[in-house]
């Protein structure tokens, strides 16, 4: 199948709703975490104030075979205006510290909750 069309949808999701859905998914991940998330995989830490959505995706996309974060990876791909592939790092991404996926998710969740409270849906 080579001809691909858009998935049917009732219409664009408002940014506030999209952000809330991402927060809910991250909450779900943190609450349902039993064993170490993604077998304790390490990812690059990111600057949460600089081009955060693409940077978060660039970091998490390098984790493969972890079903717990697949939905998050899909959601973040919609939050980033350019296509992100594994091993790709934009100039916004400072690669100096690696942290566990579980900590990455917690840090991202805290920051997104703060943005949501402040009404920063852009």
């Amino acid at each position: 199948l080579t001809c691909l069309g858009g998935f049917a949808s009732p219409g664009p999701v408002p940014p506030s709703t999209a952000l809330r859905e991402l927060i809910e998914e991250l909450v779900n991940i943190t609450q349902n975490q039993k064993a170490p998330l993604c077998n304790g995989s390490m990812v690059w830490s990111i600057n949460l104030t600089a081009g955060m959505y693409c940077a978060a995706l660039e970091s998490l996309i390098n984790v493969s075979g972890c079903s717990a974060i697949e939905k998050t990876q899909r959601m973040l791909s919609g939050f980033c205006p350019h296509k992100v592939s594994a091993g790709q790092f934009s100039s916004l991404h400072v690669r100096d510290t690696k942290i566990e996926v579980a900590q990455f998710v917690k840090d991202l969740l805290l920051h997104l909750k703060k943005l949501f409270r402040e009404g920063q849906f852009n």
């Epitope: 691909l4 069309g5 858009g6 998935f7 664009p12 999701v13 940014p15 999209a18 952000l19 104030t49 600089a50 081009g51 955060m52 959505y53 693409c54 791909s77 919609g78 939050f79 205006p81 350019h82 296509k83 592939s85 790709q88 934009s90 100039s91 916004l92 009404g119 920063q120 849906f121 852009n122």
Partner: antibody
Framework: EVQLVQSGAEVLKPGATVLISCKVS????????MHWVQQAPGKGLEWMGR????????KYAPKFHDRVTLTADTSTDTAYMELSSLRSEDTAVYYC???????????WGQGTLVTVSS | QAVVTQEPSLTVSPGGTVTLTCRSS?????????ANWFQQKPGQAPRTLIY???NRAPWTPARFSGSLLGGKAALTLSGAQPEDEAEYYC?????????FGTGTKVTVL
């Protein structure tokens, strides 16, 4: 050399549907998101939506979401934009554009003029 | 839906400096809006000047620079040339869609 070549100008009646193609060369279409932009005569630019040609996943602007359909044929490296229920205010130039981090919207098609007139 | 506003028109003297701004109705513009700036001349397709807030496209002259200024995206043209006379548009990303600015007509006079 990266090129985006769009189909030719169209003159259509209100209520009709237009399909514009954007044939790319110099890169693989599945490696990038393809965006579409509208520009009415003497007016500004308006983002219509984008498609990930790899899996067909789309994002549409609220204004266009119920009338626009973006598709891609990966076998021919061609993106398509279909706009239905045309009205006179849809008279515009439509551009396809390649977006990637290292030069967002860096490459544009030449534009396709669509004239809607009864 | 957000509205992205630019100055309708600005005039700059040859060799002079002018700053164009891009304001979001939803609040301060941030790096997560991935601001883009375009130049468009009559009868031509737009041409990308700045992407990701402050990155120049390979063909963009050094006299153009992008930044965040007072909660807005800004494009500064230092040392204006006659060929810089054009319409300039910004575009901001809002989590899942772009919105283009209203456009600024820059006259070099």
């Amino acid at each position: 050399e990266v090129q985006l070549v769009q189909s030719g100008a169209e003159v259509l009646k209100p209520g009709a549907t237009v399909l514009i193609s954007c044939k790319v060369s110099g890169f693989t279409i599945t490696d990038y998101y393809m965006h579409w932009v509208q520009q009415a005569p003497g007016k500004g630019l308006e983002w219509m939506g984008r498609i990930d040609p790899e899996d067909g996943e789309t994002k549409y602007a609220p204004k266009f979401h119920d009338r626009v359909t973006l598709t891609a044929d990966t076998s021919t490296d061609t993106a398509y934009m279909e706009l239905s229920s045309l009205r006179s205010e849809d008279t515009a130039v439509y551009y396809c554009t390649r977006y990637d981090y290292y030069g967002p919207f860096a490459y544009w098609g030449q534009g396709t003029l669509v004239t809607v007139s009864s | 839906q957000a509205v992205v506003t630019q100055e309708p028109s600005l005039t700059v003297s040859p060799g002079g400096t002018v700053t164009l701004t891009c304001r979001s109705s939803t609040g301060a513009v941030t790096t997560s809006n991935y601001a883009n700036w375009f130049q468009q001349k009559p009868g031509q397709a737009p041409r990308t000047l700045i992407y990701g807030t402050n990155n120049r496209a390979p063909w963009t002259p050094a006299r153009f620079s992008g930044s965040l200024l007072g909660g807005k995206a800004a494009l500064t043209l230092s040392g204006a040339q006659p060929e810089d006379e054009a319409e300039y548009y910004c575009a901001l990303w809002y989590i899942n869609h772009f919105i283009f600015g209203t456009g600024t007509k820059v006259t070099v006079l």
